[in-house]
């Protein structure tokens, strides 16, 4: 007789990451009876919503439902119908919406209200949409990567089941780069966290963690570029901006009104004698790097040491996972290998930025020109942020691991967020249960 497979006793969860440049929907799955075990939740699907981030819909909020449809439909297809009503859906909005809220709380609320109404129409258990804080974004990213790396598990293994595992319980730091903000989160070594705003205390699986975190609003790659342009146009003699962060031969017209639309450029705003200016790329890494460094104020620090802009940063400790745009940009530039030294990365960036725009366009025909044109800036920015901003060195560079996925799940804040909201990370170590047959490999 044919063995009939028993119905899987599994649960699902959905988290939407409403970022500044796009929205992604993640579907997670786990065995129902192992909710409190570490490492059992895994991602089964990512659906990237086609289009921009939700903050761009501020003038046409009635269309947010249309925008979200395809990925929500995908979730309906992936998750068995019998599970729909008990599958929680969470939406967390990050720095793009934080910036919109700074401009107008009313507009931000209107966007979130329409998001909530749209998501409530689906057959899932919608749990709400909110703007998460930068501190949460950092903390949940840290939880995600350490959960996936098995750092919260008390069982020591003689073999490694995940990449980067050093077979110890020392947690990884988390480096997250978005379009509008960037987060740094790690456990410092026996160091007091001098600023209370940057201190987090967790008890996870029976162990206490004192975690440092900071989110730099306006220092995501897209907002950093707007800042740089606003800073540089101040000293341009006319409406031509010769920019070392773009490839030679690249040209783009920018509206001054667009430049000053974001709160991130307010500190550089001035009355200009023109409504538009033209970026003309000259492709020079060194000059680009110098220009970026001017965005980091390192002249003032009220603590024993700072990152930049007077923000406390303890001495770096241990290994770090660098994900989101840190990974996407470095992956595009083919610089994610563990073997590539910081000197080699700098060398490669010099060559890449110097390549003529026409040559770049031909080499990367399938890449959207807006994104393609910005890789020189983004790569240079990543180096500047990590080296001068966070004080990594040529030696400590090897402790940075550019990570896209761990065990098939994307590195990012969404998994940590869901684990927290579904109470799947216990404070105490769960009582160990006898191994079931399925535990044996």
């Amino acid at each position: 007789t044919q063995n009939k497979a028993l119905p899987e006793n599994v649960k699902y969860g959905i988290v939407l990451d409403a970022g500044s440049s796009h929205t992604s929907l993640y579907i997670y799955k786990w065995p129902a009876e192992k909710e409190n075990d570490t490492g059992v939740v895994h991602q089964v699907e990512e659906c990237r919503v086609k289009g921009p981030g939700i903050s761009k819909f501020v003038q046409k909020v009635n269309e947010i439902g249309i925008y979200l449809t395809d990925c929500m439909e995908r979730a309906r297809e992936v998750i068995p119908r019998s599970q729909h009503q008990e599958t929680p859906v969470y939406l967390g909005a990050t720095a793009g919406m934080r910036l919109l809220r700074m401009e107008s709380e009313e507009l931000a609320d209107r966007v979130l209200d329409v998001v909530e109404r749209s998501l409530s129409n689906y057959p899932f258990d919608f749990q709400g949409a909110r703007i998460i804080t930068g501190q949460e974004e950092g903390a949940y990213g840290w939880i995600t990567i350490n959960y996936l790396l098995g750092k919260f598990s008390q069982k020591t293994r003689w073999f490694s089941i995940v990449p980067y595992e050093t077979n110890n319980q020392e947690t990884f730091g988390a480096l997250d780069l978005g379009g509008a903000s960037t987060q740094v989160t790690f456990v410092p070594q026996n160091q007091t966290i001098e600023s209370p705003d940057n201190a987090l205390q967790f008890r996870l699986y029976g162990k206490d963690y004192n975690v440092y975190t900071h989110s730099f609003l306006c220092y995501g790659k897209d907002q950093a570029l707007w800042q740089k342009l606003a800073k540089d146009i101040q000293v341009a003699s006319n409406e031509i901006l010769r920019d070392p962060c773009f490839h030679p031969g690249y040209k783009k017209v920018v509206n001054v009104s667009d430049l000053y639309k974001t709160p991130c450029t307010k500190r550089f705003e001035m009355t200009l004698p023109f409504q538009q200016f033209e970026i003309q790329g000259i492709g020079n890494y060194q000059q680009c790097h110098q220009s970026i460094l001017e965005l980091f104020n390192t002249s003032y620090c009220p603590y024993s040491q700072c990152a930049f802009n007077g923000i406390f940063l303890p001495p770096l400790q241990g290994d770090f996972g660098a994900f989101s745009a840190f990974y996407f940009v470095m992956k595009f530039l083919n610089l994610t290998s563990e073997k590539v030294s910081q000197e080699k990365v700098t060398e490669m960036m010099k060559k890449f930025c110097a390549q003529p725009w026409e040559e770049i366009k031909t080499s990367y025909a399938g890449v959207k020109e807006k994104y393609l044109s910005e890789y020189c800036f983004s790569g240079t920015y990543i180096l500047s942020l990590l080296l001068q901003g966070y004080h990594f060195t040529a030696d400590s560079w090897e402790h940075i691991h550019f990570i896209g996925k761990i065990q098939g799940s994307d590195a990012g804040w969404t998994l940590g967020y869901m684990l927290n909201l579904t109470n799947m990370i216990p404070a105490e170590q769960p009582l160990s249960t006898p191994l079931s047959h399925s535990t044996y490999v």
């Epitope: 086609k50 921009p52 819909f57 269309e63 439902g65 925008y67 129409n121 689906y122 399938g366 959207k368």
Partner: antibody, heavy 121, light 111 residues
Framework: QVQLKQSGAELVKPGASVKLSCTAS????????VHWVKQRPEQGLEWIGK????????KFDPKFQGKATITADTSSNTAYLQLSSLTSEDTAVYYC??????????????WGQGTTLTVSS | NIVLTQSPASLAVSLGQRATISCRAS??????????MNWFQQKPGQPPKLLIY???NQGSGVPARFSGSGSGTDFSLNIHPLEEDDTAMYFC?????????FGGGTKLELK
């Protein structure tokens, strides 16, 4: 600036197969869905199917299942429509189309110029 | 499959007047609070062009004289005031569920 360039007209014999292409410039096909639409001479429009080039998920009108295959190559920014076991009923103009939201939340649509397929012995 | 029936099959309207084209679906094309009905214009020898998406939203660069309305099973496209350039075929399309289907088309001519 965005253009969809479709391959040239095809004259093929019944029973044969053909592969039509649609190449985008100034836009990444990964950022939207690519749809294929059939229009027979002096007739209306028929939706064949669509592909999400980012993850190669495809959806078809069941009527074209087995007849049409939609694929995409993101490195060359090209989508393909392969039609098999051709008959005179497949004689038509085939359009590729992209529609969706751009970076500023404007809803766009881009269409190829159409490829004329003639099936005749 | 959802069947879309357009009426009239052809229509002649004077310059400056209002042209109204109807589209009826065999079942509701509403879902999640959205009406998944689109309207396209096609001129001879050219590909179609999106005019209206989700029943009432104007496509990029579409003149304000084109408007769409309706929900559930009954939809209409209005053109007012009619211009010479508007003579074309007009198609409705539902995108609520696969297979997406088109109406049979309405030929709009100048009177």
């Amino acid at each position: 600036q965005v253009q969809l360039k479709q391959s040239g007209a095809e004259l093929v014999k019944p029973g044969a197969s053909v592969k039509l292409s649609c190449t985008a410039s100034g836009f990444s096909i990964k950022d939207t869905y690519v749809h294929w639409v059939k229009q027979r001479p002096e007739q209306g429009l028929e939706w064949i199917g669509k592909i999400d080039p980012a993850n190669v998920n495809t959806k078809f009108d069941p009527k074209f299942q087995g007849k049409a295959t939609i694929t995409a190559d993101t490195s060359s920014n090209t989508a393909y429509l392969q039609l098999s076991s051709l008959t005179s009923e497949d004689t038509a103009v085939y359009y590729c189309a992209l529609y969706g939201y751009d970076d500023d939340a404007y809803y766009f649509d881009y269409w190829g110029q159409g490829t004329t397929l003639t099936v005749s012995s | 499959n959802i069947v879309l029936t357009q009426s009239p099959a052809s229509l002649a309207v004077s310059l400056g007047q209002r042209a109204t084209i109807s589209c009826r679906a065999s079942e509701s094309v509403d879902n999640y609070g959205i009406s998944f009905m689109n309207w396209f214009q096609q001129k001879p020898g050219q590909p179609p062009k999106l005019l209206i998406y989700a029943a009432s939203n104007q496509g990029s660069g579409v003149p304000a004289r084109f408007s769409g309305s309706g929900s559930g099973t009954d939809f209409s496209l209005n053109i007012h005031p009619l211009e010479e350039d508007d003579t074309a075929m007009y198609f409705c399309q539902q995108s609520k569920e696969v297979p997406y289907t088109f109406g049979g088309g309405t030929k709009l001519e100048l009177k």
